[in-house]
Structures are given as structure tokens and as C-alpha cells.
Interface confidence: low
């Protein structure tokens, strides 16, 4: 594992002005077709903002509204997906913030419909008419090779019939495919004969076989999934995690951080702390304290969750999940708000740290 040189009360040395967004993978905003999407340009002191999509200047039109630091896309379509950037032009310099827009109905297995037509896949059989499993819609199975960008959703379908109604199970690379085999698990929609994997990562590459069987026979079909990934990248942190939390004094709270990385990531939980009554050092950078880091005896699952038990007012503040690999660092932050316990609002707790 690559190790960080971050220790207690060290600083992250951000550039001027400090922002978290330059050093992490771009945020991903997901919308379903037809939905509206609003994104705020996360840059400070933005006097003049210009927008681009996939490197091309983006101007207002009947579906795209640009107001100040906000971009609105009305009635999104898959064509709106891409890499967006807002650039803040200042008198002496300019700064750019990148983000991804993904307009998808979360379908990848050759069917673009909403799957509201499940009846087509459920063929009713006369109970006397015993029949071995058979495919009911081979058109949806023609595309065997699926090359999907990382972080997208993949759906494989094996619509089948038979009497009695066959069961379906899935194999990965010829072996039983278990939920614990991938971060976030997977979904099986039996009524649609489908396997769904969200936020695919390179380790999801491989052959996926549906096995459909009843007492009269068994059929199978194999798809190959290739997760299209650019060259080695910093860890990708799941958008929206960790999430802001609030609890009362004495309560418990947990922050969750989901990390995706080709190279082995090193994960740390950091709290923004005060030193000598100040949150910032003389250089203007924040004081940080490492609360939890991956060690020899720590599993990935354990490090992805930060538990804070018996919360006190001193626990309030900003918490950061920081993940790094051999290529770089990414981090997301969340705030913990601590509320007075009911009926104890007037009680004042003094922390020994602040007593003279």
C-alpha cells in the first residue's frame, strides 16, 4: 500500500484559492432522460464564468439555461452526457472546475425501454404443457460484448420461458456470482430476467453467464463485460458520501465513504481540528487530525465507515474521507452537527482542552 505522510495536525497544502475539486475525479451528476438538472459552478470569486461541454463552448439554447454560476439542463437526453467545465475568469488568472453529466436510464443490455413491459418476458404456460426452458426474446441477447465506461450501470438480460417457470442464476467467469464479489453488490430482477450492476469498476470485467433451468432442462447464455477505463487514475469516491449528519449529545453517528480504485487505495479519515484556539495555522492552512487509517489488521469494509460513539459537542465539525493510490489523492468531506440532548439545553459542557 502506498502510505501518506499525513500525520496529526499536518496540513493538506491546497493551492490558492483552496478548493477540493481540482484534486479529485470530477463530480458525477446523474439524471434520467426527461429530467431537469441544475449544477452550480463550484469556484470562488467567479467574476465571469464560461462553460464548455467536452471541450466545446457551451451557450444557452432552448434547453440549456446559463444564469450566473448555475447551469440548467431542461428535459435532459443522453446526448447531454459528457464532461462539462466551468471556467472563472479573473483579472489575473482563471480557474476551471470539471464535472460529469450522465443522462441514462441505467440500461446497457441492448434494451432502451423502461422495462415496464415485463409481461412480454413472462410467458404463461398451460400447466399440462411441460416444457424445458427456452429463450423468449433472443434479440435482446444478440449483443454479447459490452464495453461500458467505468461508473456506468450495466444490465444483462436473458428473457426466458418454460413450464414449470424456470429459475435463473448468474455466474461470473464460470463461478457462482455472489453479492459480496463486488462493491455495492448487484440486483437481479427475476421478473425481467435481468442482472443489474451499478457503478461498474475495472474489477467487474469478465464473462457473465445466465443459467436458466427447470426440471426439464437447462440453457445458458454468456455476456462479456469490458469496463472501459482510461489510464491509471486517482481513487474515485462515490458522489454524496460521506453525507452530512446530525445527532444529539450522547448519540452515535457513522460516516460512510465508498472508494473505487484500480491501484490499491490507502484510506484515511481526517477531522479538521483546532490548535491553540485556531482552526488554521500561520500559513492559513487547516489543522488536520488523522482519526482512522487503514492498517495491517484493517479490512477495506472497516475503513470505509467511521463510527463516532457517545458524541460530544467537541465532535462537531468537518470530517474528511481521503483516499490515495500511486497516482494521486481524492477526498470528500461532510459535517457533523451536534444538538443538545432533549431537556438539557441549558447545561454547558466545558472541554478540558479549553480550560485555563
Amino acid at each position: 500500500r502506498p502510505s501518506f505522510s499525513l500525520v496529526e495536525d499536518t496540513t493538506l497544502e491546497p493551492e490558492e484559492p483552496p478548493t477540493k475539486y481540482q484534486i479529485s475525479q470530477p463530480e458525477v451528476y446523474v439524471a434520467a432522460p426527461g429530467e431537469s438538472l441544475e449544477v452550480r459552478c463550484l469556484l470562488k470569486d467567479a467574476a465571469v464564468i464560461s462553460w464548455t461541454k467536452d471541450g466545446v463552448h457551451l451557450g444557452p439554447n432552448n434547453r440549456t439555461v446559463l444564469i450566473g454560476e448555475y447551469l440548467q439542463i431542461k428535459g435532459a437526453t443522453p446526448r447531454d452526457s459528457g464532461l462539462y467545465a466551468c471556467t472563472a475568469s479573473r483579472t489575473v488568472d482563471s480557474e476551471t472546475w470539471y464535472f460529469m453529466v450522465n443522462v441514462t436510464d441505467a440500461i446497457s443490455s441492448g434494451d432502451d425501454e423502461d422495462d415496464t413491459d415485463g409481461a412480454e418476458d413472462f410467458v404463461s404456460e398451460n400447466s399440462n404443457n411441460k416444457r424445458a426452458p427456452y429463450w423468449t426474446n433472443t434479440e435482446k441477447m444478440e449483443k454479447r460484448l459490452h464495453a461500458v465506461p467505468a461508473a456506468n450501470t450495466v444490465k444483462f438480460r436473458c428473457p426466458a420461458g418454460g413450464n414449470p417457470m424456470p429459475t435463473m442464476r448468474w455466474l461470473k467467469n464460470g463461478k457462482e456470482f455472489k453479492q459480496e464479489h463486488r462493491i455495492g453488490g448487484y440486483k437481479v430482477r427475476n421478473q425481467h430476467w435481468s442482472l443489474i450492476m451499478e457503478s461498474v469498476v475495472p474489477s467487474d470485467k469478465g464473462n457473465y453467464t445466465c443459467v436458466v433451468e427447470n426440471e426439464y432442462g437447462s440453457i445458458n447464455h454468456t455476456y462479456h463485460l469490458d469496463v472501459v477505463e482510461r489510464s491509471p487514475h486517482r481513487p474515485i469516491l462515490q458522489a454524496g458520501l460521506p453525507a452530512n449528519a446530525s445527532t444529539v449529545v450522547g448519540g452515535d453517528v457513522e460516516f460512510v465513504c465508498k472508494v473505487y480504485s484500480d491501484a490499491q487505495p490507502h484510506i484515511q479519515w481526517i477531522k479538521h481540528v483546532e490548535k491553540n484556539g485556531s482552526k488554521y495555522g500561520p500559513d492559513g492552512l487547516p489543522y488536520l487530525k488523522v482519526l482512522k487509517a487503514a492498517g495491517v489488521n484493517t479490512t477495506d469494509k472497516e475503513i470505509e465507515v467511521l463510527y463516532i460513539r457517545n458524541v460530544t459537542f467537541e465532535d462537531a465539525g468537518e470530517y474528511t474521507c481521503l483516499a490515495g493510490n500511486s497516482i494521486g489523492i481524492s477526498f470528500h468531506s461532510a459535517w457533523l452537527t451536534v444538538l443538545p440532548a432533549p431537556g438539557r439545553e441549558k447545561e454547558i459542557t466545558a472541554s478540558p482542552d479549553y480550560l485555563e
Epitope: 502510505s3 501518506f4 470539471y98 489510464s231 487514475h233 486517482r234 500511486s326 497516482i327
Partner: antibody, heavy 118, light 111 residues
Framework: EVQLLESGGGLVQPGGSLRLSCAAS????????MHWVRQAPGKGLEWVAV????????YYADSVKGRFTISRDNSKNTLYLQMNSLRAEDTAVYYC???????????WGQGTLVTVSS | QSVLTQPPSASGTPGQRVTISCSGS????????VNWYQQLPGTAPKLLIY???NRPSGVPDRFSGSKSGTSASLAISGLRSEDEADYYC???????????FGGGTKLTVLG
């Protein structure tokens, strides 16, 4: 504005040593993977080495393994390439390049010329 | 001998469309993104295309990239005299644990 400024190039005899530096500014150096890429006169580009943001991971091209060492000093925003046992075929312009979150080798310095000759 | 193979030269007249190919293997282009760089005479290389087909901000849309299997290509439409330069493809190679470049293609704009 991102700036990368290489220095330390010059004439050295075969078997000699040289240390190149790359001074970085205009971005968060301590968060960026950094590369050295070289170009022999009239030839194409050849990747030399990469170092992770914190210096913990390093990769080298086979042609320089065991002879070159990439390092960095994040407190000085400086990248280094220590070149030992230099050969004539190491003669090239050496560029340092920054890897940005979305791109690889997004920013390049202007290069420093290393000449290995007796 | 470069790991990625490019034609040494290409040419076209102003306004024409020119395509430069880059051939590799499954361990580099096949499994990873491919980038394209433009190097004008006497200057440092400049990123032109990343991830096979994406253009950084500021790169004209006359430049486009594509990838199929273990090969990639760079297309330049509406050729201009200022496009005369050396063009390099590059990709991470899983088996070498490092970056590999093509040998470069010298583009000449005729007339």
C-alpha cells in the same frame, strides 16, 4: 498559471552523473503525479519515470531502471531526476510533466538538454 | 522500436482531412485510454486528445480521436498550415508498468 521549469542539464561524460530539477508552480504540487519524459535529438518522445503525489510509488522505463532515480520535495514544489551511469543514448531533452486529474501529461515544461559525450 | 506504431509521415493540403493511425496491443491501447500530443517545431508537446476521443478545453473541434480494439486514430479536418507538427500517441502499458509512446508522425501541410 501552471508552470514547470526544468534545470540541471548540461554536458557530461559517459559513466558520469547529473541531477535534473523541475520547479513547479501554479497548482497543488503535493497532489499531483509527476513524470519525466525525454526526447533524443530528432527522435520521438520516450517516457522515463513517474512518481506518485507523496513519493511512495515510482515506476521507471526499462531503459533507465537501476540507473535513474525519480524523487520529489513537496515542501519545495520540486521534482528531481538523479541520473547515474550515463550513456550516450541518454542524450536528450528532458521534460517534466504534470498529470492532471482528468488528463495525463497535461502540462509540460520547456525541457532541459542533457548531452552525454566524451 | 516503439511499442506503439505510427506512420512516420503524413501530408495533406489546406482544408483536407488527414488521419494518423496508432497501433498497439491489448496491454496498452486495448485495455487503457490513448492520448494524442501535438509538438510544434521547437516547443514542448501539448495534449490534444485524452481517453481516445476527448478534447481538452481550448483544442479546436477540427481534431478528433477514436479507438477500436488495439488501434487508435487521430483525425484532423480542415487542415491548416499551423497544424504542421509532430503528432504522438501514448498509452499506459499494463505489462510494462509504464507509459509508452508511438514513434511520432510528422505532418506536412502542402502548398
Amino acid at each position: 498559471e501552471v508552470q514547470l521549469l526544468e534545470s540541471g542539464g548540461g554536458l557530461v561524460q559517459p559513466g558520469g552523473s547529473l541531477r535534473l530539477s523541475c520547479a513547479a508552480s501554479g497548482f497543488t504540487f503535493s497532489h499531483s503525479g509527476m513524470h519525466w519524459v525525454r526526447q533524443a535529438p530528432g527522435k520521438g518522445l520516450e517516457w522515463v519515470a513517474v512518481i506518485s503525489y507523496d513519493g511512495s510509488n515510482k515506476y521507471y522505463a526499462d531503459s533507465v531502471k537501476g540507473r535513474f532515480t525519480i524523487s520529489r520535495d513537496n515542501s519545495k514544489n520540486t521534482l528531481y531526476l538523479q541520473m547515474n551511469s550515463l550513456r550516450a543514448e541518454d542524450t536528450a531533452v528532458y521534460y517534466c510533466a504534470r498529470e492532471a486529474p482528468l488528463y495525463d501529461f497535461e502540462y509540460w515544461g520547456q525541457g532541459t538538454l542533457v548531452t552525454v559525450s566524451s | 522500436q516503439s511499442v506503439l506504431t505510427q506512420p512516420p509521415s503524413a501530408s495533406g493540403t489546406p482544408g483536407q482531412r488527414v488521419t494518423i493511425s496508432c497501433s498497439g496491443s491489448s496491454s496498452n491501447i486495448g485495455d487503457n485510454g490513448v492520448n494524442w500530443y501535438q509538438q510544434l517545431p521547437g516547443t514542448a508537446p501539448k495534449l490534444l486528445i485524452y481517453g481516445a476521443s476527448n478534447r481538452p478545453s481550448g483544442v479546436p473541434d477540427r481534431f478528433s480521436g477514436s479507438k477500436s480494439g488495439t488501434s487508435a486514430s487521430l483525425a484532423i479536418s480542415g487542415l491548416r498550415s499551423e497544424d504542421e507538427a509532430d503528432y504522438y500517441c501514448a498509452a499506459w502499458d499494463d505489462s510494462l508498468d509504464g507509459w509508452v509512446f508511438g514513434g511520432g508522425t510528422k505532418l506536412t501541410v502542402l502548398g
